[in-house]
């Protein structure tokens, strides 16, 4: 009777064993080990008992001993048993960022490890258990779906194996893979609402401000705004579940004509975009051209209005004819013409929207100088003693110099306080003089003296 | 000076559809126009404009819509493919006005035709 | 976009009183407004432009002020001949896409 001990092992993979092969008999003719493994025979006195150690078991196996007696051959087989935890514990991959709502799915590949019978695969998110299977299969596989809610942002998810061991005396071997960490997010269906300027002036600067509510986490939300190939940089201020980015707009000549202006927002691995138009354009204010600015009394002047060749002018509130960006009128200067306002008004049509200028210049009229009547009268008849304030004005563009002499030397004191005396009285020639001529005109001084009873 | 539309009609929905404006005692290269729509029971609604130039803009529903486009006396107004939705009173109105004080222009409906009724009705 | 909103959507007034409708744009429209009134079958007739300008041969009683955002049109000592829908519309653009029109205001006169 042939006998083997152990006659159950279990061991780590690549481990070594000792097998003792015994036999009843005393003297038998055969007794030996049948094992694909490397063996090694160790000395022991007698002929009925042989120990061998086994190594590198890197597999199950059923090593046999056999023995020859006299009464017959028999053998007895020893089971061992390799363990050895999976080579490679892995969650499929994944992208982190995954919107709220969706059903994810996890898949855990368990490669190698046995006793299979004694080896779980464990799906988790942080320490909570999902799902436990056990191990099936080459690679064997392991899935669970999760159905992402809001509270899952930065949770970890891990497949972890288990070898229990325990039942054998050993203990339970855990691998476990590195860890996904889940990224949830919310972006709305709904666009990012574009307030900006439809329309703006070359070298100047308008705001534009994108804003979008709905979102989580918000602050992981990336803003890109851009005109044509112009990147904005924004200002973004967030709110619990929302976000408004400002930003300034300037632009050059080199915008002109139609830009597009984007709003980009990008959360996980989606993203919303707002386009919207804007106009650039240049439009200098009119030009109002007068033939002279200055001119003399009798004079024609040409007074034109030209603007952007499609604005629509009005000069002085007069329409052009046709309806256009050219307006002129023609006058022949008089006195009343000095200071006279020449308004040009333009409107310029850009993508629908009326904008509006405008520039006003002034004429100057030189005429003069003048001395009438009614500013210098000819005749002045006051009473002796008496408190008097000789009036002549003088007319004209420039303001003439005005004297009033008697006798080319005696002058009279125009706009001042005066006592009338006999020295008053007589005949002046008052004499109006600027760079556009001379009038004179005689003025007479009566006195009255006092009667006396 | 006078404007005046024609063509509404009843149509199947899906057939093409022109409305005509005809403006007499003003000249078209001097004004803008634009048509106008109300459907019954309904306020105005803003449908599109036409330049002195022949530039058109159109209210963001009516694009793709509507069409706009003239001759030297006549504005018209084409629906691409009418919709029930599309019943109304179509307006011509001149839509173009100076400020004499400022002397700018400004948009300004001081003009209208009596409307042309479109029904559209399977 | 210049949004109009016209308030309120409805009134009634007495043959006498006074009747008050405001139209808010969204952004400043300057003094570019004008104010129309409607009765039924007939095309809108312009009442007042530039915000307070009367159109010719309309009544004085009817009074247009404002700038800006906020317009206001005024009916005073009303007559039963005032019973229509009333709009506001701005005149300051017509780009694509845009409102012109505010929603209407209905008077009734009792």
């Known amino acids: 009777q042939t006998s083997v001990s152990p006659s159950k092992v279990i061991l780590p993979r690549g481990g070594s064993v000792l097998v003792t092969c015994s036999t009843s008999c005393d003297q038998p003719k055969l007794l030996g080990i049948e094992t694909p493994l490397p063996k090694k025979e160790l000395l022991l006195p007698g002929n009925n008992r042989k120990v061998y150690e086994l190594s590198n078991v890197q597999e199950d196996s059923q090593p046999m001993c056999y023995s020859n007696c006299p009464d017959g051959q028999s053998t007895a087989k020893t089971f061992l048993t390799v363990y050895w935890t999976p080579e490679r514990v892995e969650l499929a991959p994944l992208p982190s960022w995954q919107p709220v709502g969706k059903n994810l799915t996890l898949r855990c590949q368990v490669e190698g490890g046995a006793p299979r019978a004694n080896l779980t695969v464990v799906l988790l998110r942080g320490e909570k258990e999902l799902k436990r299977e056990p191990a099936v299969g080459e690679p064997a596989e392991v899935t669970t779906t999760v159905l992402v809610r809001r509270d899952h942002h930065g949770a970890n998810f891990s497949c972890r194996t288990e070898l229990d061991l325990r039942p054998q005396g050993l203990e339970l071997f855990e691998n476990t893979s590195a860890p996904y960490q889940l990224q949830t997010f919310v972006l709305p269906a709904t666009p990012p609402q574009l307030v900006s300027p439809r329309v703006l002036e070359v070298d100047t600067q308008g705001t534009v401000v994108c804003s979008l509510d709905g979102l989580f986490p918000v602050s992981e939300a990336q803003v890109h705004l851009a005109l044509g190939d112009q990147r904005l940089n924004p200002t973004v201020t967030y709110g619990n579940d929302s976000f408004s980015a400002k930003a300034s707009v300037s632009v050059t000549a080199e915008d002109e004509g139609t830009q597009r202006l984007t709003c980009a927002v990008i959360l996980g691995n989606q993203s919303q975009e707002t386009l919207q138009t804007v106009t650039i354009y240049s439009f200098p204010a009119p030009n109002v051209i007068l033939t002279k600015p200055e001119v003399s009394e009798g004079t024609e002047v040409t007074v034109k209005c030209e603007a952007h060749p499609r604005a629509k002018v009005t000069l002085n509130g007069v329409p052009a004819q046709p309806l256009g960006p050219r307006a002129q009128l023609l006058l022949k200067a008089t006195p009343e013409d000095n200071g006279r306002s020449f308004s040009c008004s333009a409107t310029l049509e850009v993508a629908g929207q009326l904008i509006h200028k405008n520039q006003t210049r002034e004429l100057r009229v030189l005429y003069g100088p003048r001395l009438d009547e009614r500013d210098c009268p000819g005749n002045w008849t006051w009473p002796e003693n008496s408190q008097q304030t000789p009036m002549c004005q003088a007319w004209g563009n420039p303001l003439p110099e005005l004297k009033c002499l008697k006798d080319g030397t005696f002058p009279l004191p125009i706009g001042e306080s005066v006592t009338v005396t006999r020295d008053l009285e007589g005949t002046y020639l008052c004499r109006a003089r600027s760079t556009q001529g001379e009038v004179t005109r005689k003025v007479t001084v009566n006195v009255l003296s006092p009667r006396y009873e | 000076q006078s404007v005046e539309e024609s063509g509404g009609r009843l149509v199947t929905p899906g057939t093409p559809l022109t409305l005509t404006c005809t403006v007499s005692g003003f000249s078209l290269s001097n004004y803008y126009m634009s048509w106008v729509r109300q459907a019954p029971g309904k306020g105005l609604e803003w449908i599109g404009i036409?330049?002195?130039?022949?530039s058109t803009y159109y209210a963001s529903w009516a694009k793709g819509r509507f069409t706009i486009s003239k001759t030297s006396t006549t504005v018209d107004l084409s629906i691409t493919s009418p919709t029930t939705e599309d019943t109304a009173t179509y307006f011509c109105?001149?839509?173009?006005?100076?400020?004499?004080?400022?002397?700018?222009?400004?948009?300004?409906?001081?003009?209208w035709g009596p409307g042309t009724l479109v029904t559209v009705s399977a | 976009a210049y949004d109009m909103t016209q308030t309120p959507a409805s009134v009634e007034v007495a043959v006498g009183g006074t009747v008050t409708i405001k139209c808010q744009a969204s952004q400043s429209i300057n003094s570019w407004l004008s104010w129309f009134h409607q009765k039924p079958g007939q095309p809108p007739k312009r009442l007042i432009y530039k915000a307070s300008t009367l159109a010719s041969g309309v009544s004085s009683r009817f009074k247009g002020s404002g700038s800006g955002t906020q317009f206001t049109l005024t009916i005073s000592g009303v007559e039963s001949a005032d019973a229509a829908t009333y709009y506001c519309?701005?005149?300051?653009?017509?780009?694509?896409?845009?409102?012109?029109f505010g929603g209407g205001t209905e008077v009734v006169v009792k």
């Open positions: 519309q701005q005149g300051y653009s017509r780009s694509d896409g845009e409102h012109v």
């Open positions: 036409i330049s002195d130039s022949g």
């Open positions: 109105a001149r839509d173009w006005s100076y400020d004499s004080t400022s002397g700018y222009y400004y948009y300004d409906m001081d003009l």
